[in-house]
Structures are given as structure tokens and as C-alpha cells.
Interface confidence: medium
């Protein structure tokens, strides 16, 4: 069986900074290397906008949670038909292929299955799904996700969420 894990599920970065989304997998059949697929899905709700109106969000999310949907994350869980879905990159053996939308971007799959952005861009905020596919190993949980939130800094003032404190930017 395949078991896919994203060890750090939640990343906040500043625009143009690098970030790596880690993904690890274990599989019972190791005769052939699996295909690693990273997909992007836009947030079902706007993470950043919600942070500026917590009261209304509280009411809405509490109502959703009260419905008793196990493990429901309203930012992540919705039908693909109501959000943007793209393939970011795939890796088979040592060959990494970027999806059409990401051609020209400095993005790659490093290690076995880690997705690395050398520079984040405005449209990168969303949910990233790491999928590991093997024809020899079809059982198990072959997918896990991480949330990425890219926030900007204007010349006047940082575009921050309430409670954040901006530190020095690294080169």
C-alpha cells in the first residue's frame, strides 16, 4: 500500500520568496519508481479575505461545522468544478515536467517528491496536492495536501494579516 504524507501542512510566505512543500511516501512495492504529481487547487474560500472579517466567517464556518461533516476544512473541500485546478509538475524517474501554466517558472520536484518554488508569485496561494501513483501499488492513501498562502508587501505598508509582524526579508 502507498502512504503519502505532507509533514508541514501550512505555509505563509511573502511574495517572491522561495518555499518548499514537502511530501513523503512509503510503498510496499518498490520495484519501479512511482509517478509523483503535484496539483494546484484554488481555495474554496478566500483565506486572506476571511482573516479581515472573522465575525462573519465564524458564523458561517460554525454553521458548516455544526453540520457534522468529519474533518471539514472549508478552504480546501469543495468540488473541483467550482475552483481552478492545474497540474503544477510531475516526476517520473528523474524527469520533471512542468504543467502548461507553470512553463518558464522556476519550479521543480526535488528529492523524491518535494515541490520547490524558487520564487512565489501572486497566483500561487492555494492548496497543493501531492499524489503518488504506481501501477504496482494501488491500495492505500496516495494523496496529501498543503496550504500555501502568499502575501505581498507594498512600498507603503506591508499587506499583512491582523496580528502578523513582519521581520527582515532575506536575500
Amino acid at each position: 500500500a502507498i502512504q503519502v504524507t505532507v509533514p508541514d501542512p501550512y505555509h505563509v510566505v511573502i511574495l517572491f520568496q522561495p518555499v518548499t512543500l514537502h511530501c513523503t511516501y512509503q510503498m510496499s512495492n518498490t520495484l519501479t519508481a512511482p509517478i509523483v504529481i503535484w496539483k494546484y487547487k484554488s481555495f474554496c474560500r478566500d483565506r486572506v479575505a476571511d482573516a479581515f472579517s472573522p465575525a462573519s466567517v465564524d458564523n458561517q464556518l460554525n454553521a458548516q461545522l455544526a453540520a457534522g461533516n468529519p474533518g471539514y476544512n472549508p478552504y480546501v473541500e469543495c468540488q473541483d468544478s467550482v475552483r481552478t485546478v492545474r497540474v503544477v509538475a510531475t516526476k517520473q524517474g528523474n524527469a520533471v515536467t512542468l504543467g502548461d501554466y507553470y512553463q518558464g517558472r522556476r519550479i521543480t520536484i526535488t528529492g523524491n517528491a518535494d515541490l520547490t518554488f524558487e520564487q512565489t508569485a501572486w497566483g500561487d496561494s492555494g492548496v497543493y496536492y501531492c499524489s503518488v501513483v504506481s501501477a504496482q501499488d494501488l491500495d492505500g492513501n496516495n494523496e496529501a495536501y498543503a496550504e500555501l498562502i502568499v502575501l505581498g508587501r507594498t512600498s507603503e505598508a506591508p499587506e499583512l494579516l491582523p496580528g502578523f509582524r513582519a521581520g527582515p526579508l532575506e536575500d
Epitope: 509533514p7 501550512y10 505555509h11 520568496q17 518548499t20 472573522p54 496580528g163 502578523f164
Partner: antibody, heavy 115, light 106 residues
């Protein structure tokens, strides 16, 4: 293996300042949020401060906000907590912890604030 | 703050469930962890992170699950697992928050 080693604890005087350092190894340090968590004697865990992988975001617990500064050196794989205007209630064991959903802890360093 | 029971008890071999609720209400509240502390002053050990992920050195009898806004640590077939178990979560922004701890008596 992931290891986190804290240092810098000891006896401190009220009103003074302390600097704790956590040295990390066994993983790509710059990819992970790092945190400081403390535990006062006979008390529970209290989140103190956090910093994201590239040093651009920091956040602090209410008890230390305005007195604490968290920073990191990704080249040296270290994260530092500076705590000023020390109070008796800062007496605790301070732990370094990795990740937004913490998956690894250091052994801790004990800080005693007393005259 | 996170809410968890002050204490639970079980006989060896029984299944124990410890619940944790009340994570950050609107931002980042969907990722919980469980941390075991065997004795005061000893370093916490991560039993579960990211809701249901178990570090490789943790026995498979420990598992985590998320249902609505409540996270549950399940210990199937309790052994010498007496300890204080803390739940933790992302509160708001990148800040963390912990429960007061649950003492498990076997």
C-alpha cells in the same frame, strides 16, 4: 534524524534579558516554521513565538508580546529567542519545536528568573 | 485555548479516546497535533501531527482523527502509556495554542 538542541538557559535576574539558541540538524532547516514553546513548573505547554522558514513572518504569544524577538539564521540552522524585561513568571523550561503542526521537539533548556 | 478533559483512565488493553476542541476559529484551525509528556520537565514527544500523521517511531496503536472542530487521539490497546497528553493547533496567523493537558491513568 531530526535533532533540536537548545542552549542559553540558566539563572536570570528580573528586568534582565536572555538569549536562547536552538541548533537544528537532520533536515532542510529553511523549509520549516520554527517555534519556541515553554512550560512553567507544574504548568502546561505555552506557545511563545514562531517564525516562518524564510524569516519574513513572526508571531508571539500574549505573555511575551513586546518583550520577545524571534529570529533565525538559515545558514547556521539556528533559531534564537531574545526575551527582555524578564519577570518571575518567565521561569520555565523552553523548548524549540519544528513545524506549523509540530512534529519534533528539542530537549529543552531551563530558565530561572529570580533575585 | 483548546479544550480537553483533565483526566481519563483505562485498564490495560482497553481503547482510550481523548478529545480536543476549540482551535482557531477562522484561520489555520484545521491542523492538530498530540504531544505526550511522561514526566514533568521531560521533553514532549509528538504522537500525532497534522491531524492524523504518526511519526515513524510511534506505535501504530496511536491514531488521530478530525471530526468537525474536534480532534481525537485514540489509543487502541492501552499499555504503559501513562502520561499527560497535550493537544495543540495553529490558532491564528502562524501562532500556536495548546490545551491544558489530559492525564491518562492506566
Amino acid at each position: 534524524a531530526v535533532t533540536l538542541d537548545e542552549s542559553g538557559g540558566g539563572l536570570q535576574t528580573p528586568g534582565g534579558a536572555l538569549s536562547l539558541v536552538c541548533k537544528a540538524s537532520g533536515f532542510t532547516f529553511s523549509d520549516y516554521q520554527m517555534n519556541w514553546v515553554r512550560q512553567a513548573p507544574s504548568k502546561g505547554l505555552e506557545w511563545v513565538a514562531g517564525i516562518n522558514g524564510r524569516s519574513s513572518w513572526t508571531d508571539y504569544g500574549a505573555a511575551v508580546k513586546g518583550r520577545a524577538t524571534i529570529s533565525r539564521d538559515n545558514g547556521q540552522s539556528t533559531v534564537r529567542l531574545q526575551l527582555n524585561n524578564l519577570r518571575a513568571e518567565d521561569t520555565a523550561t523552553y523548548y524549540c519545536a519544528r513545524g506549523s503542526s509540530i512534529d519534533a521537539w528539542g530537549h529543552g533548556t531551563e530558565v530561572i528568573v529570580s533575585t | 485555548a483548546l479544550t480537553q478533559p483533565a483526566s481519563v483512565s483505562a485498564n490495560p488493553g482497553e481503547t482510550v479516546k481523548i478529545t480536543c476542541s476549540g482551535g482557531g476559529s477562522y484561520y489555520g484551525s484545521y491542523y492538530y497535533g498530540w504531544y505526550q509528556q511522561k514526566s514533568p520537565g521531560s521533553a514532549p514527544v509528538t504522537m500525532i501531527y497534522n491531524n492524523n500523521n504518526r511519526p515513524s517511531n510511534i506505535p501504530s496503536r496511536f491514531s488521530g482523527s478530525l471530526s468537525g472542530s474536534t480532534n481525537t487521539l485514540t489509543i487502541t490497546g492501552v499499555q504503559a502509556d501513562e502520561a499527560v497528553y497535550y493537544c495543540g493547533s495553529i490558532d491564528s496567523n502562524i501562532a500556536g495554542v495548546f490545551g491544558a493537558g489530559t492525564t491518562l491513568t492506566v
